[in-house]
């Protein structure tokens, strides 16, 4: 008799998920000497324990605590780059500016980046067919709770000047419902963080508007100011030139506005 299986609205677990997590863990610990002590098989054990055999709409931050403990990592708290809806450019930037870190430059973020996973209640199986969608099914699903947990911890660790890269091409440049807007903004610690500096990335080549005046940016400024953190904003009119100038700051064309 075929076993009834819950059909969710979202895509299923990424194929070869355990192998991918293990392989990423091994690669990361080889590249980052400060994480060489990490036993990747134990990391996977903690990861599987967070969601396997559990109802994929009943996951809690507590479920991820063993994994958080094993993945504890110290990054320079004044070198943190947050991002919203512009992941690729943020990652390109930290690949060049090696002393700055996005969440995906940490072990736990690197392990899970672009992956989907979920289990089934009361079975030790991974569900490769479908997983809950945040909007259509439930918000307390394994992927969403993971990112909420690691994002909160990442924001809590930040200090001094924190940078955030925002997508100026979107209708809501700052979106209160994004991970940045709903988690990270509210977990920056005012006693440690002096300033949040937003970099608004322009999409069009001819776009010379000051997107720092956008209503959603003003809304972000208001939220941040109420939390006793200073706010500043810069337009990045030419993201391609911006990256080029990060690579070669001595270039003569890099003195003008980018």
């Amino acid at each position: 008799v075929p076993r009834w299986r819950q059909q969710w609205s979202g895509p299923g677990t990424t194929k070869r998920f355990p192998e991918t997590v293990l392989a990423r863990c091994v690669k990361y610990t080889e590249i980052h000497p400060e994480m060489r002590h990490v036993d990747c098989q134990s990391v996977w054990d903690a990861f599987k324990g967070a969601f396997i055999s559990k109802h994929p709409c009943n996951i809690t931050e507590e479920d991820y605590q063993p994994l958080m403990k094993l993945g504890t990592q110290t990054v320079p708290c004044n070198k943190i780059l947050l991002w919203s809806r512009i992941k690729d450019l943020a990652h390109q930037f930290t690949q060049v500016q090696r002393d700055m870190f996005t969440l995906e430059d940490t072990l736990l973020g690197y392990l899970a980046d672009d992956l989907t996973w979920c289990g089934e209640f009361n079975t030790s199986k991974i569900n490769y067919q479908s997983c809950p969608d945040w909007r259509k099914d439930c918000s307390n699903n394994p992927v969403s709770v993971f990112w909420k947990t690691v994002s909160r911890r990442f924001a809590e660790a930040a200090c001094d000047v924190v940078h955030v890269m925002l997508n100026g091409s979107r209708s809501k440049i700052f979106d209160k419902n994004s991970t940045f807007g709903s988690v990270e903004v509210h977990n920056l610690q005012p006693e440690k963080v002096q300033t949040l500096e937003a970099w608004v990335i322009h999409g069009g080549r001819e776009d010379s508007r000051d997107l720092c005046q956008d209503p959603t940016i003003k809304e972000l400024e208001s939220i941040i100011s109420k939390r006793n953190i200073q706010f500043s904003c810069k337009n990045i009119y030419r993201p391609d030139k911006f990256l080029q100038c990060v690579k070669n700051p001595e270039d003569s064309s890099c003195t003008s506005e980018i």
């Epitope: 293990l22 392989a23 134990s42 599987k48 079975t123």
Partner: antibody, heavy 120, light 107 residues
Amino acid sequence: QVQLVQSGAEVKKPGSSVKVSCKASGGTFSSYAFSWVRQAPGQGLEWMGRVIPFLGTANSAQKFQGRVTITADKSTSTAYMELSSLRSEDTAVYYCARDDIAALGPFDYWGQGTLVTVSS
Amino acid sequence: DIQMTQSPSSLSASVGDRVTITCRASQGISSWLAWYQQKPEKAPKSLIYAASSLQSGVPSRFSGSGSGTDFTLTISSLQPEDFATYYCQQYNSYPRTFGQGTKVEIK
């Protein structure tokens, strides 16, 4: 069907090393992990460590760290366990056992065991 | 390390008896528990995984239950071929650890 065939019995002197092999057939070697479990005469089972051939990485119980080396050769579908600085209390039957990489299940297949006797 | 404690360490029973073996973990292991049967001079054989799932080819008289720290292996009607030593094992975390074993002998 799946078979794990281990190397033959060994008699070793204290202070020396032993290397036991476990050849897998009937399954995709790189899709699994291989653990080594030992059993001293009249005693229970003791897990020593585990290797994931597709990654080439192993871990081991703290008790054996520095003394055990667990490796795998994908080209011959063989897992190895080398134990150094042997002492009399290492006299035991050594088993290799297979589980899935994701460790979602038990050791579903076991080798026949290799008796290692440490004696002067 | 997680300690696994089995009880009893040995028991005598007759063919047809219902036999229960318990296993307790020193900390919660969810359902990451396996049961093995071992006969003299033989390798262990997997019976139960995930605390209650029957390994393929294992007779249905074997069943497992429990989660967290307390687990049970039950043989509903003991058969002559069931006289052996039984081990529980956790695979929640490293190092993997086994119970000390329960020897089931003929009364």
